[in-house]
Amino acid sequence: HAPEDPSDLLQHVKFQSSNFENILTWDSGPEGTPDTVYSIEYKTYGERDWVAKKGCQRITRKSCNLTVETGNLTELYYARVTAVSAGGRSATKMTDRFSSLQHTTLKPPDVTCISKVRSIQMIVHPTPTPIRAGDGHRLTLEDIFHDLFYHLELQVNRTYQMHLGGKQREYEFFGLTPDTEFLGTIMICVPTWAKESAPYMCRVKTLPDRTWT
């Protein structure tokens, strides 16, 4: 019989990548049913042969973790999904070319906010990724992006904010009023890759000044 439109069974095949965790996702088309099964293959750009992803063959869920298989930062990848309906109809769709460096988004950083009497200290903890170095250690975002910055803002009142930023991990906002609440926001920025994380937020109160009591 004449081949049907693949979109009837399968739609929106794409990588969703965050902090270098690379998940292939897709939707069923209008003809898809709960018993439609999906099989996933991937390949490196420039290679001819597709590789079947173990653990993602004839599955019914609509996602597959390809983090390990697409973990080389210098390579480009494709993945494809083949959907087979209960009635034996099949459709295959391929992703756009995927680069984890280019396409990954950044999660908010992990930050410790420390209250003092007249200052607030913010310590940013390096963000681990699933990518392993040769020595087995997990790489951090700092290991991957040379031009990575932390951007910190302290909301002092409705009209005034203080800003700090750089490649360091430790910052301190000085000259604050004791026993006062402040809102801090901290973001990771990699301007050379046009990346900006969602903010981490901490609401902190400076300590009361006990020297006058």
Partner: antibody, heavy 117, light 109 residues
């Protein structure tokens, strides 16, 4: 105390090769960004290359791409710069430097590279 | 590449003078003001004075100060001392390749 000691400089003919080394101590070498920076006689300073010692990610300035290779031996806390197809304009003092706590604050004393026939 | 234009190229000063050196970036170096100032004395490597455009590095005398944002930055020495006679460089630490200004040589009149 952080220490960076360069070696391997010398006189070489145009088209020749040289391998610079930088022995590092006093910090966690295996998770740092390490740099080669050069200063030509009477000229300014130029960053040549950088490597992350954990990820192995490297960057080069355009003028040395395809000729220079930066690498490390993490077991020996040593940074290298393999320089091939050398040109007279590569003549300079070559410094290694490192970024610690976000700042490029530690530099070696430099090693002289002279490319001349 | 970001080009850093530093001026003047040299300065003749008397001890105690206030000195200002400027650095202009060919494009904005970000809201984090990723600019550093270094001092180099003959036959020596570089010493970090200022980072983040205005933050004094630990151990650097308070007569040194930095200011500016976006594309325009200034290093000031409030009262030059003999040990300050050196060449000063700005560095943009925003995007690879990191680039220096051409340097300003501060010497005695």
């Amino acid at each position: 105390e952080v220490q960076l000691v360069e070696s391997g400089g010398g006189l070489v003919q145009p088209g020749g090769s040289l391998r610079l080394s930088c022995a590092a101590s006093g910090f966690t070498f295996s998770s740092s960004w390490m740099y080669w920076v050069r200063q030509a006689p009477g000229k300014g300073l130029e960053f040549v290359s950088v490597i992350n010692t954990r990820s192995g990610i490297t960057h080069y300035v355009e003028s040395v791409k395809g000729r220079f290779t930066i690498s490390t031996d993490n077991a020996k806390n040593t940074l290298f710069l393999q320089m091939n197809s050398l040109k007279s304009e590569d003549t300079a003092v070559y410094y290694c430097a490192t970024r610690i706590q976000g700042l490029i604050d530690y530099w070696g004393q430099g090693t002289q590279v002279t490319v001349s026939s | 590449d970001i080009v850093m234009t530093q001026s003047p190229s040299s300065l003749s000063v008397s001890l105690g003078d206030r000195v200002t050196i400027t650095c202009q970036a060919s494009q904005s170096i970000g809201s984090v003001n990723a600019l550093a100032w270094y001092q180099q004395k003959p036959g020596q490597s570089l010493k970090l004075l200022i980072h983040g455009a205005s933050r004094l590095q630990t151990g650097v005398p308070s007569r040194f100060s930095g200011s500016g944002s976006g594309t325009s930055f200034t290093l000031a020495i409030s009262g030059v001392e003999a040990e300050d006679l050196a060449t000063y460089y700005c560095l943009q630490d925003y995007a690879w390749p990191l680039t220096f200004g051409q340097g300003t040589k501060v010497e005695l009149k």
